[in-house]
Every structure is written in structure tokens, then in C-alpha cells.
Interface confidence: medium
């Protein structure tokens, strides 16, 4: 029974996106009155793990010595004090990379593009996948999903940009995944440097569908325009 206690804070070190085989530590921070910490994993009978608090009792450590597919998923934690159990923490989504071979990322017609023109980033996988993710380095909200509908699987996804501005310049990587578990991603593609030349600065591009993002103006996700190239794919903004 959730009580009036404030919810704890849940985070992962070194981060929530972990390569297969690497170690990760999940931390749950509550209050100094905490007597016990509990970690729950979605789709797993609770509790997933229990730990006694570390001095000075306001947090607990849950260790995963070697990241595997089993540990990927959504977690919440609680703490118990003399007056009862806290509210649940906000969820932590632990994502594993390295579940599939790396895709190839390329730019069409070229990674060198003139401002105001168009470019398409193409993410290709060796085997058919139904989710592709494009990441731009140093973006606060870097993930753009192209996800197939009805289980249709593709060998590639296209991320068109038009018109290109200087904001689009930077380093990109892509991942592929299966829709049944967006907590399991491929190895990252090799990086692709998109270079935008020309001093003409057009208006910021806007997506074909309305996008809500908490990022600042320089940290918004890549915003492609035009029709989705594969009818079976649809955009998901995160």
C-alpha cells in the first residue's frame, strides 16, 4: 500500500543505455528514515530485488555485474520507513545495446549538403527489423523512431530532412530493433558526420506531424519532412 511518503529517485550508473556484457548499478535514493529498499521490474513478479540501505540509509545499490537481455526493461523502486512504504519512483528504462548486429548509416545523396537543400539519412540492417532509431550526438532528446506497423519488417528506414539548415549538422548514429522489445537495441552503426555548407540560413524545418518536445530550440530531435518512404513505417517521437 503506497503511503504518504515522498517517492524515491531511481537512476542507473554509468547510464541507462548499457552495452551487452557491461556492468551497471541501479541506485534508489529515498530518505534517512529508510529501513529497506525494493526494486520492481515490469513483467516480473514483485519484488525483483530487495536491499538494505547503505549508510547514511538514504539510498540502496542494486548491482548488475554483466548486462544481458534479461535485465533490459522498466524498473521502479520503493523504500520502507517506520510509517510504511513510499510511493513508487518514476520509472527507469534500462536499455541494452548489442542485441543485434550493427546497421549501416549513410547519407543520400551525400553527407556534405548545402543549406536549404535536402538529404536523406538511410539506416540499413543486414536482417529485417521493424524499428529503426536515429540518434544525434549531444541532443537532449536524440531518439527518432521509425517503426513498422502490423509486424512488417524492413531492411532499412529513411530519415529525410528538407530543407537542411546548420542545425542539422553533426554526428549521427542509428540502431535497429524489434518492436516487441524497444529495450533491446542493436550495436550502434558507425558514426556519420553530416556537414552543412553555405551561409544561407533558412527557417527551422518543422515536422509533417506536430511534435511536442521539452527540449530547447538547439536540442530538438531531427525533424524529417515529406511522406514516410515505407508505407509500413510510422514515425514515433520520443
Amino acid at each position: 500500500q503506497a503511503g504518504p511518503l515522498p517517492k524515491p529517485t531511481l537512476w542507473a550508473e554509468p547510464g541507462s543505455v548499457i552495452s551487452w556484457g557491461n556492468s551497471v548499478t541501479i541506485w534508489c535514493q529515498g530518505t534517512l528514515e529508510a529501513r529497506e529498499y525494493r526494486l520492481d521490474k515490469e513483467e516480473s513478479p514483485a519484488p525483483w530485488d530487495r536491499q538494505n540501505p547503505l549508510e547514511p540509509k538514504n539510498k540502496a545499490r542494486f548491482s548488475i555485474p554483466s548486462m544481458t537481455e534479461d535485465y533490459a526493461g522498466r524498473y521502479r523502486c520503493y523504500y520502507r520507513s517506520p510509517v510504511g512504504w513510499s510511493q513508487p519512483s518514476d520509472p527507469l528504462e534500462l536499455v541494452m545495446t548489442g542485441a543485434y548486429s550493427k546497421p549501416t548509416l549513410s547519407a543520400l545523396p551525400s553527407p556534405l549538403v548545402t543549406s536549404g537543400k535536402s538529404v536523406t539519412l538511410l539506416c540499413q540492417s543486414r536482417s529485417p527489423m521493424d524499428t529503426f532509431l536515429l540518434i544525434k550526438e549531444r541532443a537532449a532528446h536524440p531518439l527518432l523512431h521509425l517503426r513498422s506497423e502490423h509486424g512488417a519488417q524492413q531492411h532499412q528506414a529513411e530519415f529525410p530532412m528538407s530543407p537542411v539548415t546548420s542545425v542539422h549538422g553533426g554526428t549521427y548514429r542509428c540502431f535497429s530493433s524489434h518492436g516487441f522489445s524497444h529495450y533491446l537495441l542493436s550495436h550502434p552503426s558507425d558514426p556519420l558526420e553530416l556537414i552543412v555548407s553555405g551561409s544561407l540560413e533558412g527557417p527551422r524545418p518543422s515536422p509533417t506531424r506536430s511534435v511536442s518536445t521539452a527540449a530547447g530550440p538547439e536540442d530538438q530531435p531531427l525533424m524529417p519532412t515529406g511522406s514516410v518512404p515505407h508505407s509500413g513505417l510510422r514515425r514515433h517521437w520520443e
Epitope: 556484457g21 521490474k41 513478479p45 554483466s66 542485441a99 522489445s181
Partner: antibody, heavy 123, light 107 residues
């Protein structure tokens, strides 16, 4: 209905390499863990190792220096190689499938097994 | 490595009896535990996964419980066809160790 079938020589000479293949029929090899397990005569089950369809592997530490598990998704099979075998490696060898990615509905047990193949190490 | 210890190593019970087999992990494994049944000369069969989830097609007289380090497989009413060796197995991380097995016989 997915089925697994082990194949390989039933007799291996000491110090040689044991090679077995598990063919997966009636289903995809993708998105599952694929394991090898063995059972010496009159003894319990021993987990040898697993491979995920990505090629990620984990092995039993007691066998790690001698074991290689590989997968060929195009042929829908995975394989076991155990080097420098001795009489202690005589056993029934099973291949098995484990669900086990997040959200799979069976993220645990090995729900499909091959019939097993008996391997004898002897000269 | 985490060790899995089953008890008892063998037991004899009468048809209709309630039978309990326990499995203890040397460290906590949450609910990453499966139970298997192996009848003489046959392939192991999955009974329970995630400590307490009954595999499809397994009779409801089988049940599993536990989390962390202590787990139990229960047969609510023993039947003649339940004669077998039962194994627990952990799979939270490699190695996916099996218990040594519990041989169940009918009195």
C-alpha cells in the same frame, strides 16, 4: 510447431574436438536464447552455454576455455564445439530454446528441447 | 558463481500426497528460476518459469513459489505419472546453473 534436432558424430576420440549442430525447424531462430545442455550417464543436467541470435554468447565457466557456440541464422541452426575432450565429456547432449527477451511472455524457461544425442568419448 | 542446492535429493511419496521440493540459491536471483521434470529416458520438460508461472499445458497440480534465494515446487496431489527427477535452474545471469536434481518415486 517448433522442433530442434541435434546432429553430429556419436563417437569422438580423446583430445579431439566434439562438434554438434542443432537444426531449428518450424520457427525462427531469431530473438531467442539457444542453449546446449549435457547429461553424463546417470547424472544431472549441466548447462554448457547459450547464444543469442545476435551472436552474443555466455558459457559455463568450467567449460569456457574449451567451448565455442555459434549461430547461422540463414541456415536456422546453431552449433557446439568442445575441444580437447576426455571420457568425462561422454554424455547426452541436448540443444534447447529459451524465450527470454523482455516482453516475450516466457522470459525464462527452456521450453523447447531436442531429443538429445549421445556422444561417447573413446579411442 | 551462484550455487543451486535442491532438497531432498530423493523422496518417496504415495499417490494423492502433497509433495514439496525446495531449491536454494547461494545469492539472490529474484524470480529468475525455472523447474523441469525429466522422466526416465526422456527429455527434460519445462514446468515452471519465472519461479511461479506455469508453462502452458502443464497440469495445475504443479505450482511454484519463492523469490530471492528460496524456492519451492509443489505437487498438490501426486499422480503415478509424476515419477521423475525434478531440476531447478537459475538464469538471472550466466552460468544458468541447474540444481543437482530431486528423484521422486511412488511408495
Amino acid at each position: 510447431q517448433i522442433q530442434l534436432q541435434e546432429s553430429g558424430p556419436g563417437l569422438v576420440n580423446p583430445s579431439k574436438t566434439l562438434s554438434l549442430t542443432c537444426t531449428v525447424s518450424g520457427g525462427s531462430i531469431r530473438s531467442y536464447f539457444w542453449s546446449w545442455i549435457r547429461q553424463p550417464p546417470g547424472k544431472g543436467l549441466e548447462w554448457i552455454g547459450y547464444i543469442y541470435d545476435s551472436g552474443n554468447t555466455n558459457y559455463n565457466p568450467s567449460l569456457k576455455s574449451r567451448v565455442t557456440i555459434s549461430v547461422d541464422t540463414s541456415k536456422n541452426h546453431f552449433s557446439l564445439k568442445l575441444s580437447s575432450v576426455t571420457a568425462a565429456d561422454t554424455a547426452v547432449y541436448y540443444c534447447a530454446r529459451r524465450g527470454g527477451y523482455y516482453g516475450s511472455g516466457n522470459y525464462g524457461g527452456m521450453d523447447v528441447w531436442g531429443q538429445g544425442t549421445t556422444v561417447t568419448v573413446s579411442s | 558463481d551462484i550455487q543451486m542446492t535442491q532438497s531432498p535429493s530423493s523422496l518417496s511419496a504415495s499417490v494423492g500426497d502433497r509433495v514439496t521440493i525446495t531449491c536454494r540459491a547461494s545469492q539472490g536471483i529474484s524470480n529468475y528460476l525455472a523447474w523441469y521434470q525429466q522422466k526416465p529416458g526422456k527429455v527434460p520438460k519445462l514446468l515452471i518459469y519465472a519461479a511461479s508461472t506455469l508453462q502452458s499445458g502443464v497440469p495445475s497440480r504443479f505450482s511454484g513459489s519463492g523469490s530471492g534465494t528460496d524456492f519451492t515446487l509443489t505437487i498438490s496431489s501426486l499422480q503415478p505419472e509424476d515419477v521423475a527427477t525434478y531440476y531447478c535452474q537459475k538464469y538471472n545471469s550466466a552460468p544458468w546453473t541447474f540444481g543437482q536434481g530431486t528423484k521422486l518415486e511412488i511408495k
